[in-house]
């Protein structure tokens, strides 16, 4: 079968090979498309409702005044010339529609280095077949799931026209120290060959480099975190950042039921207070930052306490805040 592509809404003429140029002709067209159940036969006499969709011209060709999605399928013509020789023509018709120029919507004006950011959403409306959207950085294709690139795609079909709307949301994690003004663009590639890609206007968000946070320091009094029963331990969370972040406390990895405070006081120490404590500083512009963990232990009279608090992983405590 010969492959024919036709643009939706445009006319299409299919030649019936071997047919006499004018009547009388012995030919018939058979169609198997989205409009037919199995095969539909059309003859030169025509007439009836099919004439508005497809009719046989005086020269035997089949004329479709405006092809639609339902006209995709197989078209066959069987003709006999004046000498009784039979010729068959066989066409596979596929239709297409080029969408409008794709656009990037909800685009970010600023990205933060080192963390995932939404760059924007590329939208293409009115394509058939669906086609694909792809993203480019500085003119080079971006590969999803590589180097902090992720793409969320959505395809919707219009219930009446049957045309497709494509959406593609790009998330990237810009490298620290990378290009401060990267250029992103998006292109639509049609589902049928021989049609060039359509590209959006580029966007150039700024990349903001967060200043590395200074470390959160946890100071224990008495030093070493070893205390006799009934004594008091004071934990102080020191954060150089301004404005002061909110400080929460953890014990053995679990948040303590305390209001935010840079100081945690454990008065009248008992066995229940032994464990690993840390503080978590939450900045409005950054995520939470956890201190080192310190161990609080009880020394029985006569025991020597450790000279420094032992350091562990994360830990949240059960202390009273001051």
């Amino acid at each position: 079968a010969q492959n024919i592509t036709a643009r939706i809404g445009e006319p299409l003429v299919l030649k019936c090979k071997g047919a006499p140029k004018k009547p009388p002709q012995r030919l018939e067209w058979k169609l198997n498309t989205g409009r037919t159940e199995a095969w539909k036969v059309l003859s030169p006499q025509g007439g009836g409702p099919w004439d508005s969709v497809a009719r046989v011209l005086p020269n035997g060709s089949l004329f479709l005044p405006a092809v639609g999605i339902q006209d995709e399928g197989i078209f066959r013509c069987q003709a006999m010339n004046r000498n009784g020789k039979e010729t068959k023509s066989n066409y596979r018709v596929r239709v297409y529609q080029i969408p409008g120029k794709p656009e990037i919507v909800d685009s970010a004006s600023e990205l933060t280095a080192g963390v995932p950011n939404k760059v924007g959403t590329c939208v293409s409306e009115g394509s058939y077949p669906a086609g694909t959207l792809s993203w480019h950085l500085d003119g080079k294709p971006l590969v999803p799931n590589e180097k902090g690139v992720s793409v969320k795609e959505q395809t919707r079909r219009h219930p009446e026209t049957g045309l497709f709307t494509l959406q593609s949301e790009l998330m990237v994690t810009p490298a620290r120290g990378g290009d401060p003004r990267p250029t992103f663009s998006c292109s639509f590639s049609p589902g049928l060959p021989r049609h060039r890609a359509l590209r959006t206007a580029p966007i150039q968000p700024r990349v903001w480099e967060p200043v590395p946070l200074e470390e959160v320091q946890l100071v224990v009094e008495p030093e070493g975190g070893a205390v006799a029963p009934g004594g008091t331990v004071t934990l102080t969370c020191e954060v150089p950042a301004q404005p002061s972040p909110q400080i929460h406390w953890m014990k053995d990895g679990v948040p303590l039921p305390l209001p935010p405070s840079p100081v945690l006081i454990l008065p009248e120490i008992g066995p229940q207070d032994q464990g690993t404590y840390s503080c978590v500083a939450t900045h409005s512009s950054h995520g939470p930052q956890e201190s080192r963990a310190v161990s609080i232990s009880i020394i029985e009279p006569g025991e020597e306490g450790p000279t420094a608090g032992s350091v562990g992983g994360s830990g949240l405590g059960t202390l009273a805040l001051a």
């Epitope: 679990v254 305390l258 405070s261 454990l266 008065p267 229940q272 207070d273 405590g317 009273a320 001051a322």
Partner: antibody
Framework: QVQLQQSGAELVRPGTSVKVSCKAS????????IDWVNQRPGQGLEWIGV????????NYNEKFTGKATLTADKSSSTAYMQLSSLTSDDSAVYFC??????????WGQGTSVTVSS | QAVVTQESALTTSPGETVTLTCRSS?????????ANWVQEKPDHLFTGLIG???NRAPGVPARFSGSLIGDKAALTITGAQTEDEAIYFC?????????FGGGTKLTVL
């Protein structure tokens, strides 16, 4: 011995404010938290919020944000709860309680607040 | 908001062991709920008994103990006494606020 002494009963008009006090004695005031809890007539207990008298840090039950304001005066070892824009729904007995990290141990005797026109 | 459920009433006899429980609508009670138990006697006399699931408050008799039993917090009185007749409230911590149960009226006959 540890004591939390609350201010006396209040009869107030709707739309006004009231400030309930809780004077602590017998311990280091800034080493412990003060929670506030209420009990409406015939009802259970409801947590209002907590203050750390040492740092002034607070945490409120969402329901009482904007209704209750917790403060503490270190010099007098007194915690305060101010209730604003009072309605009859705010009629209750209000308690302060000392908390050591995760244990509410000592409670005040309660302050009855009646809102009536 | 989470709902905390307790038995409405229990009766025991002097010298018996009785267990009160505290259930959370959000699932199993864990140590990170820091279960507290508070006793209320007539005239709004409240006393904290247990905090942090199993830590006895200062001056609380050893017959009161806190624990987790299955998916609930529990207060056990081993050898109940007549003066233990009271209403017992539990409170559970949910990330940033406490929620109290409705209370259990314990009668010691």
């Amino acid at each position: 011995q540890v004591q939390l002494q609350q201010s006396g009963a209040e009869l107030v008009r709707p739309g006004t404010s009231v400030k309930v006090s809780c004077k602590a004695s017998g311990y280091a005031f800034t080493n412990y938290l003060i929670d506030w809890v209420n009990q409406r007539p015939g009802q259970g207990l409801e947590w209002i919020g907590v203050i750390n008298p040492g740092s002034g840090g607070t945490n409120y039950n969402e329901k009482f944000t904007g209704k209750a304001t917790l403060t503490a005066d270190k010099s007098s070892s007194t915690a305060y709860m101010q209730l604003s824009s009072l309605t009859s729904d705010d009629s209750a007995v209000y308690f302060c309680a000392r908390r050591r990290v995760d244990t509410m141990d000592y409670w005040g005797q309660g302050t009855s607040v009646t809102v009536s026109s | 908001q989470a709902v905390v459920t307790q038995e409405s009433a229990l009766t025991t006899s002097p010298g018996e062991t009785v267990t009160l429980t505290c259930r959370s609508s959000t699932g199993a009670v864990t140590t990170s709920n820091y279960a507290n138990w508070v006793q209320e006697k007539p005239d709004h006399l409240f006393t904290g008994l247990i905090g942090g699931t199993n830590n006895r408050a200062p001056g609380v008799p050893a017959r009161f103990s806190g624990s987790l039993i299955g998916d609930k917090a529990a207060l056990t009185i081993t050898g109940a006494q007549t003066e233990d007749e009271a209403i017992y409230f539990c409170a559970l911590w949910y990330s940033n606020h406490w929620v109290f149960g409705g209370g259990t009226k314990l009668t010691v006959l």
